[in-house]
């Protein structure tokens, strides 16, 4: 199967909604619950999510929602909102009509002729919006995550089943399987499907083996496969890297701790705009790369790679992806150059002058055997002990 094409939207940001919403087969999600398989039912209406009407909520709809979200069936009907709607009484005869307001503010309903998501449809303005909201608790709490990959969109694949997080065996694990994971998590498309030991091995059960997705499934548990077998160990835990994952490198410097800042995002390496490349952004990057702190931000060169990323950090973030970011935003990046940084752990600092020890210094570790004292963040003058 060919990789799916990247989404059309080039101008995206950390503040925007996911590329793929959780309930692709049925435009529904559960919010404000104890897990992804319980809570208030919301349906998607064009660009927004609206709470579903409780007055028309029934066991068929509840069952369909739980199945569509990969959460098993619905729990007993007693767990659902009672059928009697908490609505004001009908207006007295002769009262002025409120129909226009009621319709404009009307709540959507999820109406199902059976307990299967294909038999459901969302009907707009089906209820007055002052009524009770639909809620459901599903029988089986299923979830998916990527762990130990430096972000939510890369790492070892783990499924939550029967209350326990467990791995997926890498036998037959390929890009189609990883596509399903990435799409389900709202992480775009799969850049890599990785075999065991690319990420730290998991613990606990192995929930799946011989996974064989077509790539079109909305949920990993919809893919053909076998229950995890005993002969599959954690050294074979499957992993994935998705297009929305960001990883960074410094290029063109003396070592990996100096150079032009580049971010791998949506399958390619991109440069970073220096229009807001301040000490706080440089600090976050150096620390996340294990390169100490930022010493200097040299003047950059014109952008040479395909995309441009812009970051705005407060300096306390663990990685740049935790900062506010924008991708291919021409307004922010039009006059920019490609950001560069020199981190304190770079060996290019070793060849510089060694003045007397300043009175006030900051100590950082470069390598296990070398300690560096830095007088000033913007200075290259230091003392090697």
């Amino acid at each position: 199967h060919p990789s799916p094409a990247p989404p059309d939207q080039l101008n995206t940001s950390s503040a925007e909604s996911e590329l793929w919403e959780p309930g692709e087969r049925l435009p529904v999600r559960l919010t404000n619950g104890s897990s992804s398989c319980s809570g208030t039912v919301e349906v998607r209406l064009e660009a927004s999510w609206e709470p579903a009407c409780g007055a028309l909520w029934d066991s068929r709809a509840a069952e369909a929602v739980c199945r569509a979200l990969g959460c098993g069936g619905a729990e007993a009907a007693s767990q659902l909102a009672p059928p009697t709607p908490e609505l004001p009484p009908p207006p007295a005869a002769g009262n002025t009509s409120v129909a226009a307001n009621a319709t404009l503010a009307g709540a959507p309903a999820l109406l199902c002729s059976g307990a299967e998501w294909r038999l459901c449809e969302v009907v707009e303005h089906a209820c007055r919006s002052d009524g009770r909201r639909a809620r459901v608790t599903c029988a089986e709490n299923r979830a998916l995550r990527l762990v130990d990959g430096g972000g939510a969109c890369a790492g070892r694949v783990e499924m939550l089943e029967h209350g326990e997080w467990g791995s997926v065996c890498d036998d037959t694990w390929d890009l189609e399987d990883a596509h399903v994971v990435c799409r389900q998590l709202g992480c775009g498309w799969a850049v890599q499907a990785l075999p065991g030991l690319h990420f730290t091995p998991g613990r606990g059960p192995i929930h799946r083996d011989q996974v064989n997705c077509s790539g079109a499934e909305a949920y990993l548990w919809d893919c053909p496969g076998l229950p995890g077998q005993h002969y599959c160990g954690h050294k074979e835990d499957a992993g994935a890297v998705c297009s929305e994952h960001q990883s960074w490198r410094l290029t063109g410097g003396a070592d990996r701790c100096e150079g032009q800042v580049e971010v791998h995002f949506r399958g390619v390496w991109n440069t970073v705009c220096d229009s807001e490349w301040y000490p706080s952004e440089a600090k976050v990057l150096c620390q996340s790369l294990g390169c100490g702190t930022a010493v200097e931000r040299p003047k950059g060169l014109p952008h040479s790679l395909s995309g441009r990323m812009y970051y705005s950090c407060n300096g306390e973030e663990l990685t740049l992806s935790n900062c506010s970011w924008r991708f291919n935003n021409s307004n922010l990046c039009s006059q920019s150059l490609a950001a560069r940084v020199l981190c304190s752990a770079s060996r290019s600092l070793h060849n510089l002058s060694t003045p007397e020890v300043p009175a006030s210094v900051q100590t950082v570790t470069i390598e296990s055997s070398v300690t560096v004292k830095i007088e000033n963040k913007e200075s290259r003058e230091l003392m090697l002990l």
Epitope: L56, P85, L87, P91
Partner: nanobody, 123 residues
């Protein structure tokens, strides 16, 4: 109190058409979502079609989708059900219903029921 009076029922051959009407006494007819239920001899009452306050949203039972059309004229306080391609299994008493809180898809939200009009589909 809303009075609902159905009309338009009768005998029709399979494949034929009928148009049911439901006239409402209430001046605030447009404050109610409306719908049709039916009950065949010896069977339970079942949902047929519903329409919201101003007619912007409709919903149909799978068994009538593509054959029946629900509509309303708020200026005339009247609800309609256009029934085409009628089948023997459509034979039933058809009830007009009104609901203030939600489209009358489930019986528990219905505030008012009409007396019903009989539709017989037979050759």
């Amino acid at each position: 109190q809303v009075q609902l009076v159905e009309s338009g029922g009768g005998l029709v051959q399979p494949g034929g058409s009928l148009r049911l009407s439901c006239s409402a006494s209430e001046r605030t007819f447009s404050d109610y979502a409306m719908g049709w239920f039916r009950q065949a001899p010896g069977k339970e009452r079942e949902f047929v079609a519903a329409i919201n306050w101003v007619g912007g949203s409709t919903y149909y039972a799978d068994s009538v989708k593509g054959r029946f059309t629900i509509s309303r004229d708020n200026s005339k306080n009247t609800l309609y059900l256009q029934m085409n391609s009628l089948r023997a299994e459509d034979t039933a008493v058809y009830y007009c219903v009104a609901s203030w809180g939600a489209m009358p898809v489930l019986t528990h939200v219905i505030n008012y029921w009409g007396q019903g009009t009989l539709v017989t589909v037979s050759s």
